[in-house]
């Protein structure tokens, strides 16, 4: 007789998640030599033991507190990249500077990135059925809790001028309950940081509007300013070429751009 | 065959200065991490400094950081570590050795004495 | 005081097997591979294991290294003479950025 499972309102886990994480883990480790002697397949032991076995809607921070050990690798706490509904971008960015980052550029990030995953209370099993959506069925599943984590953390190490990536085509360019608004935002710590900068990429190439004063980035200037942290914004009217300059600064139409 | 030369070691007084050499053979050098590390009379291996390839990134045991410097000249196929501010406690033989690629220690040199002595 | 813990000693007689223990944590051993090495006085030391149980070729199957949470071991069976030597397993520590050794084992090899 096959034994009930949980339906869930979410996708299952991605399939072959443990050979992707650990296939990414040690892809990780040979693009990032300074991770040279990381272990990947204690690291999968750690991620695994976060999840498995554990019903999915009461996962905790203390659950991934083994893999966060891991978590100390030294990304340069003055070159951090935050982004909100933009990810991509913030990721074609690092790509170029290379000497900035994103939380997918550090090792949990990276192994995370994209990827679904749950198990299932008292079995050794990853539910590949379905997962539980953070609306539709609870907040404290394993992937909500793991980047509610890692995003912590990532905010906490931040220091003197952070950058922020914020998609300026959405209703609410800065969104309280994304997790930079939830999460990264509350999280700064004023001790360190002296500046937010916020890049607000404009979507329609014929867009010239200040979207810096757009109320959610004013909700968002007051919100740090609160916490004893300058803000300053700047717009992106063409993110195409943003990247090209970035690419190529010596470029004489790059003036203008950051 | 990889061959790493040590040089440089000898008698200095506290307080004094000192640097280290080692000559590498056999290997692309560039490529690769590089580290000192020492053995006091009768204690135990210690490590002391590393050097990565490409853009150098530095790393420092506690016990040296500000009073050490590793540095490498890939031109010339060499490795250093320049001792400033040496104490009694930094006597010892330092070893020069190549990292592989997971971060092991693969290749070591026979040593260079260095001690500390009024 | 050495941040991964070894015993100072270990023996056995001509062809026996001897297992050093190496205790680290989570900062260490834990998360990173562990590493062995062969020093006899007067030499350069020698890797003998790395990534927790590969070997470096030359180096013979009667070393072999294991790795569980924050413990490693060295085994070596069928004990020979040119095998008294000491030990050392080290690893990096992302507490410290940089690696740690034990404090060595002395291996005897009885008459």
């Known amino acids: 007789v096959p034994r009930w499972r949980q339906q869930w309102s979410g996708p299952g886990t991605t399939k072959r998640f443990p050979e992707t994480v650990l296939a990414r883990c040690v892809k990780y480790t040979e693009i990032h030599p300074e991770m040279r002697h990381v272990d990947c397949q204690s690291v999968w032991d750690a991620f695994k033991g976060a999840f498995i076995s554990k019903h999915p809607c009461n996962i905790t921070e203390e659950d991934y507190q083994p893999l966060m050990k891991l978590g100390t690798q030294t990304v340069p706490c003055n070159k951090i990249l935050l982004w909100s509904r933009i990810k991509d971008l913030a990721h074609q960015f690092t790509q170029v500077q290379r000497d900035m980052f994103t939380l997918e550029d550090t090792l949990l990030g990276y192994l995370a990135d994209d990827l679904t995953w749950c198990g299932e209370f008292n079995t050794s099993k990853i539910n590949y059925q379905s997962c539980p959506d953070w609306r539709k069925d609870c907040s404290n599943n394993p992937v909500s809790v793991f980047w509610k984590t890692v995003s912590r953390r990532f905010a906490e190490a931040a220091c003197d001028v952070v950058h922020v990536m914020l998609n300026g085509s959405r209703s609410k360019i800065f969104d309280k309950n994304s997790t930079f608004g939830s999460v990264e935002v509350h999280n700064l710590q004023p001790e360190k940081v002296q500046t937010l900068e916020a890049w607000v990429i404009h979507g329609g190439r014929e867009d010239s509007r200040d979207l810096c004063q757009d109320p959610t980035i004013k909700e968002l200037e007051s919100i740090i300013s609160k916490r004893n942290i300058q803000f300053s914004c700047k717009n992106i009217y063409r993110p195409d070429k943003f990247l090209q300059c970035v690419k190529n600064p010596e470029d004489s139409s790059c003036t203008s751009e950051i | 065959q990889v061959q790493l030369v040590e040089s440089g070691g000898g008698l200095v007084k506290p307080g004094g200065s000192l640097r280290l050499s080692c000559a590498a053979s056999?290997?692309?050098?560039?490529?690769?991490?590089m580290s000192w590390i020492r053995q006091a009379p009768g204690k135990g291996l210690e490590w002391v400094a590393s050097?990565?390839?490409?853009?150098?990134?530095?790393y420092y045991a506690d016990s040296v950081r500000g009073r050490f410097t590793i540095s490498r000249d890939n031109a010339k196929n060499s490795l250093y570590l320049q001792m400033n501010s040496l104490r009694a406690e930094d006597t010892a033989v330092y070893y020069c050795?190549?990292?592989?690629?997971?971060?092991?220690?693969?290749?070591w040199g026979q040593g260079t004495l260095v001690t500390v002595s009024s | 005081q050495s941040v991964l813990t070894q015993p100072p000693s270990a023996s056995g007689t001509s062809g026996q097997r001897v297992t050093i223990s190496c205790s680290g944590s989570?900062?260490?051993?834990?998360?990173?591979?562990v590493y062995w090495y062969q020093h006899l006085p007067g030499t350069a030391p020698k890797l003998l294991i790395y990534?927790?149980?590969q070997r470096p070729s030359g180096v013979p199957d009667r070393f072999s290294g294991s790795k569980s949470g924050n413990s490693a071991s060295l085994a070596i069976s069928g004990l020979r003479s040119e095998d008294e030597a000491d030990y050392y397993c080290?690893?990096?520590?992302?507490?410290?950025?940089?690696?740690?050794f034990g404090s060595g084992t002395k291996v005897t090899v009885l008459g």
């Open positions: 050795a190549r990292e592989g690629w997971s971060g092991e220690f693969t290749d």
């Open positions: 056999g290997f692309t050098f560039s490529d690769d991490y």
């Open positions: 050097v990565s390839s490409g853009r150098p990134t530095t």
């Open positions: 989570s900062s260490n051993i834990g998360f990173h591979f």
């Open positions: 990534k927790n149980n």
């Open positions: 080290a690893a990096w520590d992302d507490s410290l950025s940089g690696y740690v």
